[in-house]
């Protein structure tokens, strides 16, 4: 759990400004999940402020790692039954310390708002939210205060009067083996798991359940997950593939089949064919991680979040491993820098996604007057005199291949190369032996290397041309 700079956002900053040390406080606010109220509205379900706050003394410009959250939990007492669906608002406040703080002592550094579904008694839910340059890591859970138990904290438990068993007609209280259910104030038979009451003899249902005793899932039968009643109600059978397979209803909606198609019964606050539309509006700031809230034409209509690359989910709350989409072609190595993707290309490939095959003449041309020659699924450059390398970008050493035969000495020249032949040899590459009797020169068998005198070569060369 931490509050600190988000990834890829430059040098981490301290939350303190130049006016000296500071402390961070966290204000947690709970609102009804289907609240259409303004963001600044009352925290109808409860609110609390963190305590035992550490002091940070870093100053701007100094590096600041992720900051530890204040010790201990922030407990938000809620009134009445736990609704299951709620809006969670976490504000990070900075309190400036010191005599010369000047200006406002309190500043709101960050504010995250999100709609959540959570049953009481469940495990810790983890979350990461980014707002501006800051990232907040936190966990949350809902717990019932004794004697209340259950997903809505609407069932009451009492300590056992006898160590071994509960009183007549009362069951042990799960998950508290040493406690018994208190005498029911709800309507007799009201489901302890799916129903609750706020007044005697009533039975209110949690989302997804219906019926006078909240024992029927919101679907056409009491069988869950598209199963159908078996013969003589012996149980539920799994039918062949049906329209409700995989439950197309989002956000906890219940699916029921209707003449070859399906129908979703949506929990409070959601609507649409698949319960994909939330009653939260853009005014509630539901899009995380730089997501843009796109609403309908009127202010109260549904919203959709357009997520920046790298995030997904209905509220852009899930980070995507963009490299898993394998955007780099031709075996390039993918690097997700947060603010951008980069591809490190294999030799022979280039481009932002390594899409350009340098072994293809349709790609970049050969430099310095070279000609591209394709063949055998690859390309090579036939370079102009004096150039070499893969793309003819390197100045070539024409003498590197020892082109002068019979000990001829090679000299690089602007037009290519010139061979200075050893005595007794002639030709462009010194390939001919000169006969002493003045007969025609004939190709000679290779001999060992011999030194030649450049002066003599030049003299003979000029003499030969005149």
């Amino acid at each position: 759990h931490s509050f600190g700079p988000g990834p890829g956002l430059g040098t981490p900053r301290s939350p303190c400004n130049a006016r000296g040390p500071c402390r961070l406080f966290f204000r947690v606010c709970l609102k009804p999940g289907v609240s259409q109220e303004a963001t600044e509205s009352l925290c109808a379900l409860g609110a609390a402020l963190s305590t035992s706050v550490p002091v940070y003394t870093e100053h701007p410009g100094e590096s600041a790692a992720a900051l530890p959250l204040p010790d201990g939990l922030v407990r938000v007492p809620f009134r009445d039954a736990w609704p299951g669906t709620f809006s969670l608002v976490i504000e990070t406040w900075r309190e400036q310390l010191g005599e010369h703080a000047g200006g406002p002592a309190w500043n709101l550094l960050a504010r995250v708002v999100g709609r959540r579904r959570l049953a009481a008694g469940g495990p810790w839910a983890r979350d990461v939210q980014r707002t501006g340059t800051w990232e907040l890591h936190f966990s949350y859970r809902a717990r019932c205060e004794p004697p209340a138990v259950g997903a809505a904290c609407a069932r009451l438990c009492r300590s056992r009067s006898a160590p071994s068993r509960c009183g007549p007609g009362l069951r042990p209280c799960t998950p508290f083996p040493d406690e018994c259910e208190a005498p029911s104030v709800c309507r007799p038979g009201c489901s302890p798991e799916h129903g609750y009451c706020e007044e005697p003899d009533e039975c209110r249902c949690l989302e997804g359940w219906t019926g006078p005793l909240c024992t029927v899932p919101v679907s056409t039968s009491s069988c869950l997950n598209s199963r159908v009643p078996g013969p003589a109600s012996t149980g539920c059978l799994l039918p062949g593939p049906g329209p409700c397979d995989g439950n197309p209803c989002a956000n906890g909606g219940s699916c029921s089949e209707t003449s070859g198609s399906f129908e979703c019964a949506c929990p409070r606050g959601f609507y649409g064919l698949r319960c994909e539309v939330s009653g939260v509006t853009c005014a509630d700031g539901p899009c995380f991680n730089g997501g843009l809230c796109v609403g309908g034409e009127d202010p109260d209509s549904a919203y959709v979040c357009h997520c920046p690359p790298g995030f997904q989910g209905s509220n852009c709350e899930k980070r995507v491993d963009r490299c898993s989409l394998q955007p780099c072609q031709n075996g390039g190595l993918c690097l997700d820098l947060g603010h951008a993707l980069r591809c490190r290309c294999r030799a022979g490939f280039a481009g932002p996604r390594c899409e350009h095959d340098l072994d293809d003449c349709a790609g970049r041309a050969c430099a310095n007057g070279g000609t591209c020659v394709e063949g055998g699924g690859s390309r090579r450059c036939s370079c102009a005199l004096g150039f070499g390398g893969r793309d003819c970008r390197e100045r070539a050493d024409p003498c590197a291949s020892r082109p002068c035969a019979h000990g001829g000495r090679c000299y690089a020249h602007f037009s290519g190369l010139v061979c200075a032949c050893a005595p007794g040899y002639m030709g462009v590459r010194c390939e001919f032996a000169v006969r002493p009797d003045g007969a025609d020169a004939v190709p000679a068998a290779p001999r060992g290397l011999r030194q030649a005198d450049p002066q003599r070569f030049l003299h003979h060369h000029h003499h030969h041309h005149h």
């Epitope: 956002l9 303004a38 963001t39 600044e40 960050a110 504010r111 995250v112 708002v113 707002t131 501006g132 340059t133 853009c282 005014a283 509630d284 700031g285 539901p286 899009c287 995380f288 730089g290 997501g291 843009l292 809230c293 796109v294 609403g295 357009h306 920046p308 690359p309 790298g310 963009r322 955007p327 947060g338 603010h339 951008a340 993707l341 481009g351 932002p352 996604r353 899409e355």
Partner: antibody
Framework: QVQLQESGPGLVKPSETLSLTCTVS????????WSWIRQPPGKGLEWIGY???????NHNPSLKSRLTISLDKAKNQFSLRLSSVTAADTAVYYC????????????WGQGTMVTVSS | EIVLTQSPGTLSLSPGERATLSCRAS???????LAWYQQKPGQAPRLLIY???SRATGIPDRFTGSGSGTDFTLTISRLEPEDFAVYYC?????????FGGGTKVEIN
């Protein structure tokens, strides 16, 4: 460094369709949102709309009925078509890349002036 | 749509002075999704600040953004000659994306 270049006719007649293209160089058009913004002479900036490489689009409601934004991955280009133009559509039209930390604009083309006149 | 009102319309200052530009939103901007741009004559705007307070790449630290909710501020601590330009704020929390009318910072 990524570069954006707008292209298209500088003069369009009233009631006709304004068509502009933005060519993206030194970066792939994939994995970003791409946007159009305009600025009438001597006035402020007005967002027109954006497109994602997946095909997701979002338009300014004031222009939505006349606006089409499309994308050509093969050519690394995206385009704007604004129908039934009037003199009020005379502006410098900019294409821009949407920043990856949110819908601000971190890289802009140099802009192209479009005049609507008969 | 969220309307952004910038003030003052024009700010006449000398090099070395401090400039404070204001941007006020007609409704709360979620998650400080606000950006600032600088535009010089004949040029495209340049992103200075995003997330209300984070400097974009290559922006000098004399540019500082602050604020949340409906009130945001861009501060230029010591004006350099190249800072005289028009500055726009933009919100990107709710569609449609909207810009303020601009503040012109001119040499006094």
């Amino acid at each position: 460094q990524v570069q954006l270049q707008e292209s298209g006719p500088g003069l369009v007649k009233p009631s006709e369709t304004l068509s502009l293209t933005c060519t993206v160089s030194d970066d792939s058009i994939s994995n970003y949102y791409w946007s159009w913004i305009r600025q009438p002479p001597g006035k402020g900036l007005e967002w027109i709309g954006y497109i994602f490489y997946s095909g997701t689009t979002n338009h300014n409601p004031s222009l939505k009925s006349r606006l089409t934004i499309s994308l050509d991955k093969a050519k690394n280009q995206f385009s704007l078509r604004l129908s039934s133009v009037t003199a009020a559509d005379t502006a410098v039209y900019y294409c821009a890349r949407v920043f990856n930390w949110g819908f601000a604009f971190d890289i802009w083309g140099q802009g192209t002036m479009v005049t609507v006149s008969s | 749509e969220i309307v952004l009102t910038q003030s003052p319309g024009t700010l006449s200052l000398s090099p070395g002075e401090r400039a404070t530009l204001s941007c006020r939103a007609s409704q709360r901007i979620s998650r400080t999704y606000l950006a600032w741009y600088q535009q010089k004559p004949g040029q495209a705007p340049r992103l200075l600040i995003y997330g209300a307070s984070s400097r974009a790449t290559g922006i000098p630290d004399r540019f500082t953004g602050s604020g949340s909710g409906t009130d945001f501020t861009l501060t230029i601590s010591r004006l350099e000659p190249e800072d005289f330009a028009v500055y726009y704020c933009q919100q990107y929390g709710t569609s449609p994306l909207t810009f303020g009318g601009g503040t012109k910072v001119e040499i006094n």
